[in-house]
């Protein structure tokens, strides 16, 4: 959950408590288990080669 009093994240990003900032949903492709990815709609999983080249 986003910290009280903080501005909402812009489109394509979601609040990360771990990073204490808005984070790019695009990065969920490489790091799908990041805390903020739950707030990103339909983030695609990483391709097989990116995770295990």
């Amino acid at each position: 959950e986003q910290a009280p009093g903080t501005a909402p994240c812009s489109r394509g990003s979601s609040w990360s408590a771990d990073l204490d900032k808005c984070a790019d949903c695009a990065s969920c492709r490489a790091r799908p288990h990041s805390d903020f990815c739950l707030g990103c709609a339909a983030a695609p999983p990483a391709p097989f080669r990116l995770l295990w080249p």
Epitope: R29, R31, P44, R49
Partner: antibody
Framework: QVELVESGGGLVQPGGSLRLSCAAS????????MSWVRQAPGKGLEWVAE??????????HYAESVKGRFTISRDDSKNSLYLQMNSLRAEDTAVYYC??????????WGQGTLVTVSS | DIQMTQSPSSLSASVGDRVTITCRAS??????????MHWYQQKPGKAPKLLIK???NLESGVPSRFSGSGSGTDFTLTISSLQPEDFATYYC?????????FGGGTKVEIK
């Protein structure tokens, strides 16, 4: 503020070894992927090696040009990144940059350290 | 490996000019939602600096005269009104897969 400071560069003979270090501060080092990127004199940027997180079993990846010769490592307790370079060649001469990123785009860069391989 | 082709390799422009740099990847670096293309600025003797990530997301603190666009294989970095501090070399980079590769760079010089 974020700071990445490389050290360990210098002049080395072909076939020699060198170990580069990068001291990080100002961000949660253990949460960030780290890479080394190099730039030969007057040339463009070349990605060299990457190391991921403890949760990824510190997975490493290398450019073909350095595979088997270079080893990337990190010490999260010291907020430090390393590059062990063995069997150095003239074509490894470059400024070596330490970079940090959560994923994808390289947000943080050090000032670079020059490695010169020459006899 | 994905090859990145940047053009032009150099250009001369005046303060106030609109400048466009293109980058073409040898294969698509986009999903239906995001493009894994990034742009950096490098000044002589300095480290590169991230300007734009994911094709069009301006990095915090970067002036709004910089913008990025494109998807698939073709991407563009635009400087709407060139300022004296913008004379530098610009690089694109993909993060679609390993190895990450950079374009050859575009040097923006003073006319």
């Amino acid at each position: 503020q974020v700071e990445l400071v490389e050290s360990g560069g210098g002049l080395v003979q072909p076939g020699g070894s060198l170990r580069l270090s990068c001291a990080a501060s100002g961000f949660t080092f253990s949460s960030y992927w780290m890479s080394w990127v190099r730039q030969a004199p007057g040339k463009g940027l070349e990605w060299v090696a990457e190391i991921r997180l403890k949760s990824d079993n510190y997975a490493t990846h290398y450019a073909e040009s350095v595979k088997g010769r270079f080893t990337i490592s990190r010490d999260d307790s010291k907020n430090s990144l390393y590059l062990q370079m063995n069997s150095l060649r003239a074509e490894d001469t470059a400024v070596y940059y330490c970079t940090g990123y959560y994923a994808d785009a390289m947000d943080y860069w050090g000032q670079g350290t020059l490695v010169t391989v020459s006899s | 490996d994905i090859q990145m082709t940047q053009s032009p390799s150099s250009l001369s422009a005046s303060v106030g000019d609109r400048v466009t740099i293109t980058c073409r990847a040898s294969q698509s670096v986009s999903t239906s939602s995001y493009s894994y293309m990034h742009w950096y600025q490098q000044k002589p003797g300095k480290a590169p600096k991230l300007l734009i990530k994911y094709a069009s997301n301006l990095e915090s603190g970067v002036p709004s005269r910089f913008s990025g666009s494109g998807s698939g294989t073709d991407f563009t970095l635009t400087i709407s009104s060139l300022q004296p501090e913008d004379f530098a070399t610009y690089y694109c980079q993909h993060s679609w897969e390993i190895p990450y590769t950079f374009g050859g760079g575009t040097k923006v010089e003073i006319k």
